[in-house]
Amino acid sequence: MMTGTIETTGNISAEKGGSIILQCHLSSTTAQVTQVNWEQQDQLLAICNADLGWHISPSFKDRVAPGPGLGLTLQSLTVNDTGEYFCIYHTYPDGTYTGRIFLEVLESSVAEHGARFQIP
């Protein structure tokens, strides 16, 4: 039975040109995490595997940094980065847990004066 829960940063906003940390936390389970995938819609951003470490997708290598922890840092944000991001925890014996984060990238002035979402 899958007892775990994923806590995420939820809906967040950031300024164009800035950076943001995406974080998920798996709790309430003693299952072993074997791999964490970070995806944007259907695109793979990065993988952190228990035996192989981190792999950053070549198309994101310049703008994505692993960490802190199992999180992911997105840099040099553009408006095109707006959208859904998913953290997928592969665990044994529970199976797969998925968390969702919605990121809105705003023009600098908009972000300063009334962002729709607040960074927790």
Partner: antibody
Framework: QVQLQQPGSELVRPGVSVKLSCKAS????????MHWVKQRHGQGLEWIGN????????NYHEKFKNKGTLTVDTSSSTAYMHLSSLTSEDSAVYYC??????????WGQGTTLTVSS | DIVLSQSPATLSVTPGDSVSLSCRAS??????LHWFQQKSHESPRLLIT???QSISGIPPRFSGSGSGTDFTLSINSLETEDFGMFFC?????????FGGGTKLEIK
């Protein structure tokens, strides 16, 4: 098997600089963070900073920003920490340790740095 | 920076006893808390990761619990090789930080 090899000791004069090394083997060097940790005699552990060899991305503890510089040589799978303007306060054991899915899962044996005239 | 406070600073116990070591964070770190053991003149060794995940090769008498700001490392039926220093460490945010340690000594 995973190994992080560090020289056992370094003896340097106050005011000079030193470059500590950490040679990694048994895994893909560019896929794991490399951390550096300081431990003064019989005391606690202090995180200095880390570097991701795949991109060169670094993070430093504010306290060590003007003291240490982290670099890597991916061709030899070696991480380096350059410590400058050494004083007796820098005398300590310095460990390197890697992080992938789990932080600090493998550690070097540590280099004992002695700063003395 | 996130401050990790460990208690007690020193614990004197007898082999066969069970103990609980505490680590408290100055703000929520979710489950991004890891436990290490360090014996004299040795490098630290990872015991428990992400608050409660066991590590391959570590005896099952070591277990971890907690989330948010309060964490516990439990050791059941202590053996002589279990004595030494124990540190907690957080990976929730840069800079990573360590607790000051708990010394587990033989009574």
């Amino acid at each position: 098997q995973v190994q992080l090899q560090q020289p056992g000791s370094e003896l340097v004069r106050p005011g000079v600089s030193v470059k500590l090394s950490c040679k990694a083997s048994g895994y893909t060097f560019t896929s794991y963070w490399m951390h550096w940790v300081k431990q003064r005699h019989g005391q606690g552990l202090e995180w200095i900073g880390n570097i991701f060899p795949g991109s060169g991305t670094t993070n430093y503890h504010e306290k060590f920003k003007n003291k240490g510089t982290l670099t890597v040589d991916t061709s030899s799978s070696t991480a380096y920490m350059h410590l400058s303007s050494l004083t007796s306060e820098d005398s300590a054991v310095y460990y390197c340790s890697r992080e992938g899915l789990y932080p600090f899962d493998y550690w070097g044996q540590g280099t004992t740095l002695t700063v003395s005239s | 920076d996130i401050v990790l406070s460990q208690s007690p600073a020193t614990l004197s116990v007898t082999p066969g006893d069970s103990v609980s070591l505490s680590c408290r964070a100055s703000q929520s770190i979710r489950n991004n808390l890891h436990w290490f053991q360090q014996k004299s003149h040795e490098s630290p060794r990872l015991l428990i990761t992400y608050a409660s995940q066991s590590i391959s090769g570590i005896p099952p008498r070591f277990s971890g619990s907690g989330s948010g700001t309060d964490f516990t490392l439990s050791i059941n039926s202590l053996e002589t090789e279990d004595f030494g220093m124990f540190f907690c460490q957080q990976s929730n945010s840069w800079p990573y930080t360590f607790g000051g340690g708990t010394k587990l000594e033989i009574k």
